[in-house]
């Protein structure tokens, strides 16, 4: 319905707590290195003016749009021009154009300080002291990190944090309440951001059918016994929910996806006998519990797809009223009939069959043509089958470092042109699906991996293409999103690449290597790892094995040595010695 | 300096096993990195396995992997081949070698060097 002030709206929908945070949020991840107190000044402004709307919908600039009245509170920052450079020149246009402007201008690998944990004591005399502010900051510190993350499901982290802290800062051992409770939150958060990246990747890069068509897939697996129409509804709703977060609308946003939730809660008996538990939740913890719903249980007596996609005479006639229906439809009841199978297989299955039906329609005797379509699906079904087979294979034989140890060295091999910070953190991520995936039966491995790796491997396409250095990164992230993983699976050593100049420098280390995380640590070796990689591309694995296990070995002598820095001074010169003259450097 | 001697070495039936063992002494054994390699008439010596110093690390030839386990024991200044499911390509003489590098010992460069021992599997 139009409403004559959309931001009173949005204000009475919302509820003041929710506008504020939501405000802050969408400012921080356009201004992503604006300071704190800048961002809580211009979201009290916003807000003020909001509660002025809601008294007077008829009062000056109330009618105006949400991204007038937020961009042009943006440009009112007087540091734009130094802070930002040419986003400033966003100023200068008119909307939709500026708001665009700012969209292109989000940085995924912005230049911000890592964020150190505090104290546990630190931290709770700061919640207790001002909780407002210290959960604002939160929310700041997040958004401004992860200009993508799913804003309504960020509410939803905010709240578990502040949780957390009323909770644990009044228990008797602080640490050892709140410390997991964080890690937890952090960890949970990296995924949410990554998983919502790929939906904005989608869609902006491959647009709102590419987008539909993975919700169809992965809703019709998720919800097998409810019908097509209401499966095409909740895909509709869905799509609108994202398309307005990834694009900056954030009150918007959150507000369909409460619509969305009740819609769901009211109409389970026709979705899924799943929803029931979250259905009864508050409204942030409903709209997680149903994103995280497990699958239905699929109906009993299924028919054979062939009936109706390759057997009936209708086929291309059905095909060519409504292609895309049809081809939704299809993909609705392989989904549903597949939840072993992941979502990218599926759609690669359709898009199989989309390209056989637009091939043999033309064709003379169509149905003789498509008639043996089903079994091109067999070797695209165990592609990734045996992919996922062996590496889990590789996982539970070496472990989690050392398999992504494998997984650097093969892919820095296949793109050495990347930077090493990306690579080692996607290959670090991309280990990850061992111990994520590989403990599920057979039936849930595939749709856990493929779809855990389409995530991953969107990571280094957003990295990638802030800086483009490789144009076999580009052509695997832009050609088709579905062949992604068996894009970059496919490529081998990159014959083309010219080693990189030996630096001894980056092999040298320090006796503060002793006082890190096992985590940083392990980071520090796979950077050193990655760099041999560079140097050496043909080396083989068990020369850099070699060479890595002399560098723990370095390691772990000069961190029990009396004087660690001589230690590491004069020890890692030999070493840096040995493996120049073992890998012919 | 360091003396490296072994022991273990004989005539075993396809498909038996050996234990070869590699006796340090001199400098302090848990320094080093040790590891075998092996000589068959008329061939290249070839990489067999290694052990870091603190046993925490090993690496074998692709040809040996799930059939031969090195090992050590530092408080015996002793180190030790596993031989199982011997097979005719076995034959050679088996050298024991320690160096401070693995990096180092791989490409057979290892400082120090033992006489060596004769496997012979015969079919």
């Known amino acids: 319905d139009a409403h004559k002030s959309e931001v009173a709206h949005r204000f009475k929908d919302l509820g003041e707590e929710n506008f504020k945070a939501l405000v802050l949020i969408a400012f921080a991840q356009y201004l992503q290195q604006c300071p704190f107190e800048d961002h809580v000044k211009l979201v009290n402004e916003v807000t003020e003016f909001a509660k002025t709307c809601v008294a007077d919908e008829s009062a000056e600039n109330c009618d105006k749009s949400l991204h007038t009245l937020f961009g042009d509170k943006l440009c009112t920052v007087a540091t734009l021009r130094e802070t930002y450079g040419e986003m400033a020149d966003c100023c200068a246009k008119q909307e939709p154009e500026r708001n665009e402007c700012f969209l292109q201008h989000k940085d995924d690998n912005p230049n911000l300080p890592r964020l150190v944990r505090p104290e546990v004591d630190v931290m709770c005399t700061a919640f207790h002291d001002n909780e407002e502010t210290f959960l604002k900051k939160y929310l700041y510190e997040i958004a401004r990190r992860h200009p993508y993350f799913y804003a309504p499901e960020l509410l939803f982290f905010a709240k578990r944090y502040k949780a957390a802290f009323t909770e644990c800062c009044q228990a008797a051992d602080k640490a050892a309440c709140l410390l997991p409770k964080l890690d937890e939150l952090r960890d949970e958060g990296k995924a949410s951001s990554a998983k919502q990246r790929l939906k904005c990747a989608s869609l902006q890069k491959f647009g709102e059918r590419a987008f539909k068509a993975w919700a169809v897939a992965r809703l019709s697996q998720r919800f097998p016994k409810a019908e097509f129409a209401e499966v095409s509804k909740l895909v509709t709703d869905l799509t609108k929910v994202h398309t307005e977060c990834c694009h900056g609308d954030l009150l918007e946003c959150a507000d369909d996806r409460a619509d969305l939730a009740k819609y769901i809660c009211e109409n389970q008996d026709s979705i899924s006998s799943k929803l029931k538990e979250c259905c009864e939740k508050p409204l942030l913890e409903k709209s997680h519990c149903i994103a995280e719903v497990e699958n239905d249980e699929m109906p009993a007596d299924l028919p054979s797809l062939a009936a109706d996609f390759v057997e009936s005479k209708d086929v291309c006639k059905n095909y060519a009223e409504a292609k895309d229906v049809f081809l939704g439809m299809f993909l609705y009841e392989y989904a549903r009939r597949h939840p072993d199978y992941s979502v990218v297989l599926l759609l690669r299955l359709a898009k199989t069959y989309e390209t056989t039906l637009e091939k043999c329609c033309a064709a003379a005797d169509p149905h003789e043509c498509y008639a043996k379509v089903f079994d091109e699906f067999k070797p695209l079904v165990e592609e990734p089958q045996n992919l996922i087979k062996q590496n889990c294979e590789l996982f539970e034989q070496l472990g989690e470092y050392k398999f992504q140890n494998a997984l650097l060295v093969r892919y820095t091999k296949k793109v050495p042109q990347v930077s090493t910070p990306t690579l080692v953190e996607v290959s670090r991520n991309l280990g990850k699906v061992g111990s994520k995936c590989c403990k599920h039966p057979e039936a849930k491995r595939m749709p856990c991996a493929e779809d855990y790796l389409s995530v991953v491997l969107n990571q280094l396409c957003v990295l990638h293409e802030k800086t483009p250095v490789s144009d076999r990164v580009t052509k695997c992230c832009t050609e088709s999103l579905v062949n992604r993983r068996p894009c970059f699976s496919a490529l081998e050593v990159d014959e083309t690449y010219v080693p990189k100049e030996f630096n001894a420098e980056t092999f040298t280390f320090h006796a503060d290597i002793c006082t890190l995380s096992e985590k940083e640590r392990q980071i520090k070796k796979q950077t050193a790892l990655v760099e041999l990689v560079k140097h050496k591309p043909k080396a083989t694995k068990e020369q850099l094995k070699a060479v890595m296990d002399d560098f723990a070995a370095f390691v772990e002598k000069c961190c029990k040595a009396d004087d660690k820095e001589t230690c590491f001074a004069e020890e890692g010169k030999k070493l840096v010695a040995a493996s120049q003259a073992a890998l012919g450097l | 300096q360091v003396q490296l001697v072994e022991s273990g070495g004989g005539l075993v039936q396809v498909g038996g096993s050996l234990r070869l063992s590699c006796a340090a002494s001199?400098?302090?054994?848990?320094?080093?990195?040790m590891g075998w390699f092996r000589q068959a008439p008329g061939k290249e010596r070839e990489f067999v396995a290694y052990?870091?110093?603190?046993?925490?690390?090993?690496s074998y030839a692709d040809s040996v992997k799930g059939r031969f386990t090195i090992s050590r024991d530092n408080t015996k200044n002793t180190m030790y081949l596993q031989m199982n499911s011997l097979k005719p390509e076995d034959t050679a003489v088996y050298y024991c070698?320690?160096?401070?590098?693995?990096?180092?010992?791989?490409?057979?460069?290892?400082?120090?060097w033992g006489q060596g021992t004769q496997v012979t599997v015969s079919s």
């Open positions: 070698t320690a160096d401070q590098y693995a990096s180092t010992l791989l490409r057979a460069a290892g400082e120090y």
């Open positions: 001199g400098r302090t054994f848990s320094n080093y990195v």
């Open positions: 052990i870091h110093w603190s046993g925490s690390s090993t």
